[in-house]
Interface confidence: low
Amino acid sequence: DNASQEYYTALINVTVQEPGRGAPLTFRIDRGRYGLDSPKAEVRGQVLAPLPLHGVADHLGCDPQTRFFVPPNIKQWIALLQRGNCTFKEKISRAAFHNAVAVVIYNNKSKEEPVTMTHPGTGDIIAVMITELRGKDILSYLEKNISVQMTIAVGTRMPPKNFSRGS
């Protein structure tokens, strides 16, 4: 059961540089969670969503043909993917194949809190889940070709909840 596992919160800062705007817009994403099998480490990079596939937006990253446009001057980048249609492991592994340093998966149910993802065997790539609202917020900038930088840092270790009777 997800609630009975310990998990680590992720402290996420997002910086958006809109054209024509002097100072960048920065905001914090609360309630992010590291995946169970993710390294609990800090990472920074430019956020990228997959390229369209067959004329349709690809938010899920489940298709074997999923591709990312990685600018040649970018050393570290973070994949933004929506939850659903395939396992967390598949999504994370596909982004890792394209040399992402981290994957941020946003939920696919607006009222639901992030879960602690399980994705054994994905190696060194950092994996975090955020709410659907925040994920779509970031995606809206990417769809306008606006550069988005993200820093993910380790927050608090949350111990497993004790479900014993009488507590």
């Epitope: 446009f69 990685v70 040399n99």
Partner: nanobody, 118 residues
Framework: QVQLQESGGGLVQAGGSLRLSCAAS????????MGWYRQAPGKEREFVAS???????YYADSVKGRFTISRDNAKNTVYLQMNSLKPEDTAVYYC????????????WGQGTQVTVSS
């Protein structure tokens, strides 16, 4: 196999403009990145600009504000509008098509010479 044909190079005075074109033919899968690189005499080939299918654009710092990359997906063609040219822009300009995310460009054009005189 993909063929790339560049055109539009030539001799221009400093401060002038040129527009390069690159048409891709052959087997073109749906979504790919097109870009321009250049190689000056005695130097390594360097990135100039690139554009994704969805028109996300990226530029080398040395050409930002002077060069504009665009593309016509229907014609499988990419353009490089070069304004305020400088002598240091002199080079052979190569078009490239990338079908993957890591800039291992599989296909290159033959190149077009751009010479900027002072």
């Amino acid at each position: 196999q993909v063929q790339l044909q560049e055109s539009g190079g030539g001799l221009v005075q400093a401060g002038g403009s040129l527009r390069l074109s690159c048409a891709a033919s052959g087997y073109i899968s749906g979504y790919y990145v097109m870009g321009w690189y250049r190689q000056a005499p005695g130097k390594e080939r360097e990135f100039v600009a690139s554009i994704s299918y969805g028109a996300s654009t990226y530029y080398a710092d040395s050409v930002k504000g002077r060069f504009t990359i665009s593309r016509d997906n229907a014609k499988n063609t990419v353009y490089l509008q070069m304004n305020s040219l400088k002598p240091e822009d002199t080079a052979v300009y190569y078009c490239a098509v990338d079908f993957d995310s890591n800039y291992a460009h599989t296909y290159w054009g033959q190149g077009t010479q751009v010479t900027v005189s002072s």
